[in-house]
């Protein structure tokens, strides 16, 4: 049986392909005949499914580029908070228990996300192997206001999160130390195993495997919401917006942002992945009577999709007697 293939490297050249290269085993123990390449999609960190990204002032946005990781914090203009009423000077409010808890969760969130970055870029390797060379991501923490009261994490189980392991595929590579794996999902992590096989493979089997982890590049437009946004009137000056989720997103969709308004789209609503999975859309409440437009944008592991075309809807004024009694 030959020894394992050496120096396995993988890089992504597109959103659906990975190029894999390696060197022959140091001990072929006979005539080297072929290699077996196996690949398997890796599940996302469960935290990414459970975490409510709407509850944070900061959300991970990954920009795909060569180079090192750059975790940058972009802060908004400080909000002026009047703590002592109109007459009193502005002062630092004492932290509530809820705020202390939020800070603790923020630290946990940051730790998990940084682990995610580290594991998806600086990939784990077998002992004494060279580090994988692959394209990596610059990371920006982008800040935006979140109009939500949802909890930081959800206990509800996402069907995808239950998927502990995905099907694997195998291919035989003859007479070369390189292959291109196709038909992959965008911005998704794969484990690639390679066995070296010699003339006695049928009888004695091939080598143990050497492996590498690699992530495909993001796909342009993969996070765009397909198809139309629709709406339904609801009681109490509210409406329900529905939209289809991106079919094959970059990694997974973390949240959606709705911008809406009557004159200008100046109001924002954040819809977490978990809320969308539960309701298939979002309810906009406390709307004044009138005509509105709304647009929706998905945010995935690799960044933002495009805003949808505007959907036009209206909220009717309550008529006559109904208005009078209110």
């Amino acid at each position: 049986v030959p020894s394992i293939p050496l120096d396995v490297l993988s890089a992504s050249n597109s959103s659906s392909q990975l190029i894999v290269k390696w060197n022959p085993p140091s001990l072929p123990n006979g005539n080297l005949s072929y290699y077996i390449v196996r690949w398997q999609r890796q599940p996302q960190d469960g935290y990414l499914y459970r975490h409510n990204y709407c509850s944070k002032d900061k959300i991970p946005i990954r920009k795909y580029a060569d180079g090192t990781i750059d975790i940058e914090e972009v802060t908004e203009n400080p909000k002026t908070e009047v703590c002592g009423g109109e007459k009193g000077p502005c002062c630092a409010c004492p932290k509530t228990e809820a705020e202390k808890q939020a800070e603790k969760e923020e630290a946990e969130y940051r730790k998990v996300f940084e682990n995610f970055l580290h594991n998806s870029i600086f990939v784990p390797r077998p002992e004494r192997k060279r580090r994988d060379v692959m394209q990596v991501a610059n990371t920006t923490m982008s800040s935006r206001s979140r109009n939500t009261t949802a909890a930081d994490t959800y206990n509800i189980t996402d069907p995808e999160e239950l998927e502990t392991e995905y099907p694997f595929f195998e291919s035989r590579v003859d007479n070369k130390e390189r292959t291109v794996i196709s038909n992959l999902r965008p911005f998704t992590l794969y484990r690639i195993d390679i066995h070296s096989c010699n003339h006695e493979a049928e009888k004695l089997g091939c080598s143990a495997s050497n492996f590498v982890f690699a992530r495909t590049m993001p796909a342009e437009g993969a996070d765009d919401i397909p198809g139309p946004v629709t709406w339904e009137p609801r009681p109490e000056n509210s409406i329900f917006l529905k939209w289809p989720e991106p079919e094959n997103p970059n990694g997974l969709i973390l949240m959606y942002e709705i911008k809406y308004g009557s004159q200008v789209e100046d109001q924002r609503e954040c819809v977490s992945r978990q809320e969308y999975r539960k309701y298939g859309g979002a309810k906009l409440n406390r709307l004044n009577p009138g005509n509105y437009t709304a647009r929706i944008q998905a945010t995935s592991l690799s960044g933002n999709g495009s805003w949808t075309d505007p959907v036009f809807f209206y909220v009717q004024a309550k008529t006559g007697y109904e208005n009078f009694i209110h």
């Epitope: 077996i36 392991e165 995905y166 099907p167 595929f169 195998e170 049928e202 091939c206």
Partner: antibody, heavy 117, light 107 residues
Framework: EVQLVQSGGGVVQPGTSLRLSCAAS????????MHWVRQAPGKGLEWVAV????????YYADSVKGRFTISRDNSKNTLYLQMNSLRAEDTAVYYC??????????WGQGTLVTVSS | DIQLTQSPSFLSASVGDRVTITCRAS??????LAWYQQKPGKAPKLLIY???TLQSGVPSRFSGSGSGTEFTLTISSLQPEDFATYYC?????????FGGGTKVEIK
Amino acid sequence: EVQLVQSGGGVVQPGTSLRLSCAASGFSFRSHGMHWVRQAPGKGLEWVAVISYDGSNKYYADSVKGRFTISRDNSKNTLYLQMNSLRAEDTAVYYCATIGPGGFDYWGQGTLVTVSS
Amino acid sequence: DIQLTQSPSFLSASVGDRVTITCRASQGISSYLAWYQQKPGKAPKLLIYAASTLQSGVPSRFSGSGSGTEFTLTISSLQPEDFATYYCQQLNSYPLTFGGGTKVEIK
């Protein structure tokens, strides 16, 4: 030439057990994942189970979970399906198959299992 | 579990006809779809994988297309040996599932 030769089928009573075998030749069996698929008489195909090349990972269809066990003996180049607590609805032709770059590229000839009282 | 709905279930056609079979997935499966041909008393044979890649040794009159939830298998000019049952299969996630089959019969 890749060959998957199946054996072990037969007629058994409900509640009993049976073990199917799939002997592989013509390829490096111990480096490949393997699947079982079944087909009830006059019906469509149903995936049953998968085992990784080294036997470390196994997955089953809900309909057989807890009753069937997929295993392999790499020294004998043989795949097995141990079927316990058999039911009438397990009556089918059972196939072993190898996985390729995107589908089951090699199949055994099939072996018929009939569960009847 | 992902359900695959094949249509039609039965199809009568003549030699030389262009035949199209569709397979609809209950949720998006990207391009993780394979097509098989099965003749009575025989094991299935892989025709197409990754939705559109022709398996080695399969005649070029067979072609596959689609991604996400809608897929088609097309036989451009039906030959006598093509009368058989055709199945689609999703390999996106466990449990792997098959469509109900389409039987192509001689008209």
